[in-house]
């Protein structure tokens, strides 16, 4: 149990203890949510105190102060999703439909995702929110008819599945137009039959 002497400058529990070179001893770190209020000596272990309101320490530490909680900046597109506690800093995230445009250890600036025009969709990324949309054309047999950052290409309607016949083929930007087999002129409505 700390404090104890250490000749090789290493401690048994690296996470919860630290080496104090002046006395050449291993002392306890303070747990998350606390800080060092009195340093250790050969005869007394570290004394810890709870972080004051609006401050925190996330890890086992031997800091003599707590870190100040910082708000998220909505002007930069960042929003708090969990408040600061004594053990955890404010959790910020880009607002939905935005991506992180600037990083400095953590995201500092978010921007709106670009719209993908009709006939395209946003390429799915492994790490969502880390970059702007890259729009790719709808694959064969699919369409997308809006300008949107998140709309997905949908499969063309199969007229025969509805007992109808194709009046006009679908494109990358529009659905198939179907009509009743008995009709000579195609109706205006895409993908469905006008009664």
């Amino acid at each position: 149990v700390p404090p104890y002497g250490s000749e090789n400058q290493t401690c048994r529990d690296q996470e919860k203890e630290y080496y104090e070179p002046r006395h050449r001893i291993c002392c306890s770190r303070c747990p998350p949510g606390t800080y060092v209020s009195a340093k250790c000596s050969r005869s007394r272990d570290t004394v810890c105190a709870t972080c004051a309101e609006n401050s925190y320490n996330e890890h086992w530490n031997y800091l003599t102060i707590c870190q100040l909680c910082r708000p998220c900046d909505p002007v930069m597109g960042l929003e708090e999703i969990a408040p600061c506690t004594s053990k955890r800093k404010t959790q910020c995230r880009c607002q939905p439909g935005m991506f992180c445009a600037a990083w400095a250890l953590e995201c500092t600036h978010c921007e709106l995702l670009s719209d993908c025009p009709p006939g395209t969709e946003a390429e799915l990324k492994d790490e969502v929110g880390k970059g702007n949309n890259h729009c790719v054309p709808c694959k064969a047999g699919h369409f997308q008819n809006t300008s949107s950052p998140s709309a997905r290409c949908q499969p063309h309607t199969r007229c025969e599945d509805q007992g109808l016949v194709e009046a006009a083929p679908g494109t990358a930007q529009s659905d198939t137009t179907c009509r009743n087999p008995s009709e000579s002129l195609p109706p205006e409505m895409s993908g469905t039959m006008l009664m």
């Epitope: 708000p71 998220c72 909505p74 929003e79 708090e80 999703i81 969990a82 408040p83 959790q91 995230r93 607002q95 939905p96 439909g97 995702l113 799915l124 990324k125 492994d126 790490e127 969502v128 929110g129 880390k130 950052p149 998140s150 997905r152």
Partner: antibody
């Protein structure tokens, strides 16, 4: 302590209008997206509408687009939902929620649509 | 729109049981997922955010995992106060969407 208090619910006929309000306190209102979520009796949660912190961007679920309008007053810490052309399927408890990850919720206000 | 499919829709369990609820997104949402608990007549309460981060004051028997499209909420040892309905929710993009809910009932 965060508090969200909804008001304005009631009985309305199909096709009618209603304006819901949410009074917020205990947090920096202008820093958060604010949302309306609804829950029909015995059913699950459905997000209805949201507004960005500055009020410059609004979002709606498809079934209410063109009928509902969300707005906020950051000076008064209030969130509103103007509902028009109400339908039977709009009947639900409407709850105001803080943040896009719904950190805190109000208790809700009941909207009944019936003739 | 991103569809959130939750399973099972209901389950029966006993106090002390380990309970697992899954949620699948129709497209990748990274870790932009929250879990909520709702009891009858009460407003929902958030338990987990960013897929695996525990909200302040939530018991450590609750845990979340997953990223991309597949997510899990686990209750390591079910307590009497945990009988409730649980919902997942994605906040990657608008429209924000919830799963259909999982009702955890007493066996």
């Amino acid at each position: 302590e965060v508090q969200l208090v909804e008001s304005g619910g009631g009985l309305v006929q199909p096709g009618g209008s209603l304006r819901l309000s949410c009074a917020a306190s205990g947090f920096t209102f202008s820093s958060y997206t604010m949302n309306w979520v609804r829950q029909a009796p015995g059913k699950g949660l459905e997000w209805v509408s949201g507004v960005a912190p500055s009020g410059d961007r609004t979002y709606y679920t498809d079934s209410v687009k063109g009928r509902f309008t969300i707005s906020r007053d950051n000076a008064k810490n209030t969130l509103d939902l103007q509902m028009t052309s109400l339908r039977a399927e709009d009947a639900a408890i409407y709850i105001c929620a803080q943040g896009f990850a719904f950190t805190n919720w109000g208790q809700g206000t009941m909207v009944t649509v019936s003739s | 729109d991103i569809q959130m499919t939750q399973s099972p829709s209901s389950l029966s369990a006993s106090v002390g049981d380990r309970v697992t609820i899954t949620c699948r997104a129709s497209q990748g949402i990274s870790s932009a997922l929250a879990w909520f608990q709702q009891k009858p007549g009460k407003a929902p309460k958030r338990l987990i955010f960013d897929a695996s981060s525990l909200d302040s004051g939530v018991p450590s028997r609750f845990s979340g995992s997953g990223s991309g499209t597949d997510f899990t909420l686990t209750i390591s040892s079910l307590q009497p106060e945990d009988f409730a309905t649980y919902y997942c929710q994605q906040y990657n993009n608008y429209p924000l969407t919830f799963g259909g809910g999982t009702k955890v009932e007493m066996k």
